[in-house]
Amino acid sequence: KSSSEATNITPKHNMKAFLDELKAENIKKFLHNFTQIPHLAGTEQNFQLAKQIQSQWKEFGLDSVELTHYDVLLSYPNKTHPNYISIINEDGNEIFNTSLFEPPPAGYENVSDIVPPFSAFSPQGMPEGDLVYVNYARTEDFFKLERDMKINCSGKIVIARYGKVFRGNKVKNAQLAGATGVILYSDPADYFAPGVKSYPDGWNLPGGGVQRGNILNLNGAGDPLTPGYPANEYAYRRGIAEAVGLPSIPVHPIGYYDAQKLLEKMGGSASPDSSWRGSLKVPYNVGPGFTGNFSTQKVKMHIHSTSEVTRIYNVIGTLRGAVEPDRYVILGGHRDSWVFGGIDPQSGAAVVHEIVRSFGTLKKEGWRPRRTILFASWDAEEFGLLGSTEWAEENSRLLQERGVAYINADSSIEGNYTLRVDCTPLMYSLVYNLTKELESPDEGFEGKSLYESWTKKSPSPEFSGMPRISKLGSGNDFEVFFQRLGIASGRARYTKNWETNKFSSYPLYHSVYETYELVEKFYDPMFKYHLTVAQVRGGMVFELANSVVLPFDCRDYAVVLRKYADKIYNISMKHPQEMKTYSVSFDSLFSAVKNFTEIASKFSERLRDFDKSNPILLRMMNDQLMFLERAFIDPLGLPDRPFYRHVIYAPSSHNKYAGESFPGIYDALFDIESKVDPSQAWGEVKRQISIATFTVQAAAETLSEVA
């Protein structure tokens, strides 16, 4: 068969063949292979894994597989001068030191190159002073401390518990509060689920376990030294002082054994309420400083990490499209890990590997997708989404013209309860339809669809009989594609029961205990949840690359735009007097949303009725669908965040992981009652409403009949 004939096999048959080829046993085997040694970004081990993946993707049958390298700023602990925190007495003697490395898990005691826990990109420094406990170090926690409790963090070392928000936001907040250092720790209240044993006997965090992670505030910039441009051999690099997003104060993470020793001596103010108290046997006093007997003791940080320009490698595989080779559907996930990466990222990388193998098998049998599929194994995600961002910067002109969709493939699991999907509204119907065709892996749902178990376990808060789909935030490799370039994006993984498990992330996240055994013993022994995630991710890619008409429904965007407009209007209406005084109106925005709704409805009718055998018309309609997400991009970006350009969605300014709708308006309204110049502040709200109105109206017009 020729490739064009092969493409004409009925889509259902192709999709079924693709899905049937995916095997749980292969995912298990790949996960084991990817997790035997650490694959830290910038290391030889991770380069070797890149070459292995390149070679295997070629064997699987992709048309081409290339390594693309960039020289980016990374950060590592000093091997001969370890980072730690001390309690020092009045003579300056260290009477307690935090641990230098995590106790290695059984079977891994002799593995070399396990990077000790550190906060990537922390500057060097040895600040000493009194401790202040700042809860999760969220914006509202500092408001409580500074405004209500009148506690000044200036010149103090703050200790914050991990969870609720991205650690980089915690550090930024501490810096703004005048802190001289930050200690991050995992509290059992957030990282130890009741009734479960700690690793290696269960999936909970042991006392010596520590969460690594970067503490950047890049706001989508990619490599801190080359914002906006690829970090290639001729790139101009900023000096460290001008680098984007680097923290200015030392930061270090610790486990709860060590945290206990610091927190048990805390004096000063009592915690304001129970929401500030974790599960350690300590008073959770806020400070500043230690209590009576220990008041002369101080805390001292010893941070000696270095930042250095280091080479990273992406693997980019191509499966050329038979009909529209200039239209790209991208499946990407990262390869670099903090240590073994048992969940993050290798549970995702193993799924990508099996998806590539399945597509390759079909291709070897003569089939090709309608559109080109690009597969990516990103490097340095843990250091600020660097591999994906640099590649997208290098290929931005192609991507903005040809990018149909991006499907992210980091960790396949963060629990084993139900499906979790975050995506553009354009993909809602695709996800619903696909999950109705897939079998649920959940106990008690044998013979039922994934859609059914997902809806039952994670119902939509707005629409009964439908599952919840969340907004895209950031903290993963879809960021540059969605937030900067406006390429329709989505992600899917299996998650925990958020009702019963209130802890943040999964307990062993970014610790040395995130091993193959963790997954195989406790999360997914049969790899059935991994297989389901492979089917969802792979199925989405298949449909996006192979449907004659792109599986996007613009009417779903209309629905959410109305919801987001209502939400932001309600926030603003908490200040009715000021709205009146400064003539703030949302009428124009609601009008634009109404126009969008009407035009989207008419477009959907035309899409249903047009002659799909007419290649020009088909391409025209598909281009309107493809470019709709692009239409929400403002080339000027959001205030002070030039690389977050999507007007409808952006990562929250207070938590990178969370998505915020109408972020420009939201940020302009945030804490507006405390602004020194209310006239200027409300003027900015009005400016942001006008930008949002224009963008929604302009996007609507891209769906209008062309002539």
Epitope: N97, A106, E109, P206
Partner: antibody, heavy 123, light 107 residues
Framework: QVQLVESGGGVVQPGRSLRLSCAAS????????MHWVRQAPGKGLEWVAV????????YYADSVKGRFTISRDNSKNTQYLQMNSLRAEDTAVYYC????????????????WGQGTTVTVSS | DIQMTQSPSSLSASVGDRVTITCRAS??????LAWYQQKTGKVPKFLIY???TLQSGVPSRFSGGGSGTDFTLTISSLQPEDVATYYC?????????FGPGTKVDIK
């Protein structure tokens, strides 16, 4: 099987130095805190020093502080006790003992003991 | 520093007797207390940790109790092989001091 073997004991003059070693086998040495305990002839047990699994903390009995130094080499599965400025009252059997597996315990007793090595300080 | 005291310093009891040894800490140590048995000329043996948890392989006639500053070691039915000196030890905070020991023998 789990084993601790002390060595380095002997007769030494007051004021001189001695270095004791404790070779560990049969367990994941790099996960365990390690102690030295001594017992003077006909007397009770006296705790001497402890070192955390990663060497981050070292604590000493007041009687040896400033004279003895505990250390470890995880790559060699060995812990050491450097004893300087020895005194007659340091004469004892010195036991190496395993503390808690830090993967499981922060606080724990000493569950495995070596046979001991005798140190005699005499002129 | 935390001082540990034990009473009695020695005791004699008959086979089958219930024997209780007391250990007191000069300040609260939560339940971070261990008990050891040392027979004459032998290496100490770990009996109990966290004040009341029996180390595996230790006969069930041994039990521990207490919290804070006052602790007990009980042998419910004394056996000839229990003749030894028993030591308590604080491991709440360094220095991890031992008690002076209680010598147990058979009448």
């Amino acid at each position: 099987q789990v084993q601790l073997v002390e060595s380095g004991g002997g007769v030494v003059q007051p004021g001189r130095s001695l270095r004791l070693s404790c070779a560990a086998s049969g367990f994941a040495f790099s996960r365990y805190g390690m102690h030295w305990v001594r017992q003077a002839p006909g007397k009770g047990l006296e705790w001497v020093a402890v070192i955390w699994y990663d060497g981050s903390n070292k604590y000493y009995a007041d009687s040896v502080k400033g004279r003895f130094t505990i250390s470890r080499d995880n790559s060699k599965n060995t812990q050491y006790l450097q004893m300087n400025s020895l005194r007659a009252e340091d004469t004892a059997v010195y036991y190496c003992a395993r503390g808690g597996d830090f993967l499981y315990y922060y606080y724990y007793g000493m569950d495995v003991w070596g046979q001991g090595t005798t140190v005699t300080v005499s002129s | 520093d935390i001082q540990m005291t034990q009473s009695p310093s020695s005791l004699s009891a008959s086979v089958g007797d219930r024997v209780t040894i007391t250990c007191r800490a000069s300040q609260g140590i939560s339940n971070y207390l261990a008990w050891y048995q040392q027979k004459t000329g032998k290496v100490p043996k770990f009996l109990i940790y966290e004040a009341s948890t029996l180390q595996s392989g230790v006969p069930s006639r041994f039990s521990g109790g207490g919290s804070g500053t006052d602790f007990t070691l009980t042998i419910s039915s004394l056996q000839p092989e229990d003749v030894a000196t028993y030591y308590c030890q604080n491991y709440n905070s360094a220095p991890f001091t031992f008690g002076p020991g209680t010598k147990v023998d058979i009448k």
